[in-house]
């Protein structure tokens, strides 16, 4: 469920959203940290309904839900790191 | 403009079973993910349960979930409530409620409810 | 179960007054909180999502603050038209819950 990309583009985010999202309704999170091209930070929300939305990194529901995903995932298999580029 | 419009309550007997229907319109009603919430005399909200858009996941109070069963036809746009073994406590107002999963992600559309009595 | 309480079942105020209704969960529920307003032969009517934004069309004398467990919802100036059951809701987890309501009625 929580995946981080490491990519040579620019920042994939225009808006982003601090509105609280349900984990049911959460399919995956994906993070793009900082640098390569983009200054901050990002973290996109890949909804069950198959929309998009960005969340503000400082939002604080997305921190706590990272928090437990990384811990849940930290006893059981280590967070998955994606090489990709982004065309 | 968003409606839904609640059919279905009335007067049944402890022991009976009822099914309450919410027809929507104004809305993609296979998109979004439906509840039923009540609220029983001098009462709060209480939650039953919801259901997905495709009927592949569907989540009830614990304390309820033998009892009714939820199911949806959205070729006919319509939510129902299938309520079994009911008693005096399930006689309540009876709400539908679109949960919406794109913007607010609470409930933001309900129905006009209808009431059910348990009496014999 | 995550239990919403509402410490006020029934608060009297004044047309122009500011009240604020509080609602403490019995766990984190970060903001997935809710404000919901009924009024007397009607349905409920969402005023607040996500702890502090305030639903389309909504007045903005009505506001919603707080986060974990400690959620505030506040009508700066109270109107004729406001007397109803306020309800604090979590949606952060299943199953879903309501607070037992805050009946506001004026003097």
């Known amino acids: 469920v929580l995946e981080v990309y490491y990519t040579s583009l620019r920042c994939r985010c225009v808006q982003e959203s601090s509105v609280f999202i349900p984990r049911r309704f959460i399919d995956r999170i994906q993070i793009l940290p900082r640098g390569n091209g983009c200054p901050r930070k990002e973290i996109i929300v890949w909804k069950k309904n198959k929309s998009i939305v960005c969340v503000d990194p400082q939002a604080e529901w997305i921190q706590r839900m990272m928090e437990v995903l990384r811990k849940r995932s930290s006893s059981t298999l280590p967070v998955p790191v994606f090489k990709r580029k982004i065309p | 403009e968003v409606k839904l419009l609640q059919s279905g309550g009335g007067l049944v007997q402890p022991g009976g079973s009822l099914k309450l229907s919410c027809a929507a319109s104004?809305?993609?009603?296979?998109?979004?993910?439906m509840s039923w919430v009540r609220r029983a005399p001098g009462k709060g909200l209480e939650w039953i349960g919801e259901i997905n858009p495709d009927s592949s996941t569907i989540n009830y109070a614990p304390s309820l979930k033998d009892k009714f069963i939820i199911s949806r036809d959205n070729a006919k746009n319509t939510l129902y409530l299938q309520m079994s073994k009911v008693r005096s406590e399930d006689t309540a107002l009876y709400y539908c409620a679109r949960q919406d999963d794109y913007d607010y992600y609470a409930m933001d559309y309900w129905g006009q409810g209808t009431s059910v009595t348990v009496s014999s | 179960d995550i239990v919403m309480t509402q410490s006020h079942k029934f608060m009297s105020t004044s047309v122009g007054d500011r009240v604020s209704i509080t609602c403490k969960a019995s766990?984190?529920?970060?903001?997935?909180v809710a404000w919901y307003q009924q009024k007397p032969g009607q349905s409920p009517k969402l005023l607040i999502y996500?702890?502090?934004y305030r639903y389309t069309g909504v007045p903005d004398r009505f506001t919603g603050s707080g986060s974990r467990t400690d959620f505030t919802f506040t009508i700066s100036s109270v109107q004729t038209e406001d007397p109803a059951v306020y309800y604090c809701h979590q949606y952060y987890t299943i199953p879903l819950t309501f607070g037992a309501g805050t009946e506001l009625e004026l003097k």
């Open positions: 996500s702890a502090s």
């Open positions: 766990q984190d529920v970060s903001t997935g």
């Open positions: 104004g809305i993609d009603f296979s998109r979004y993910w």
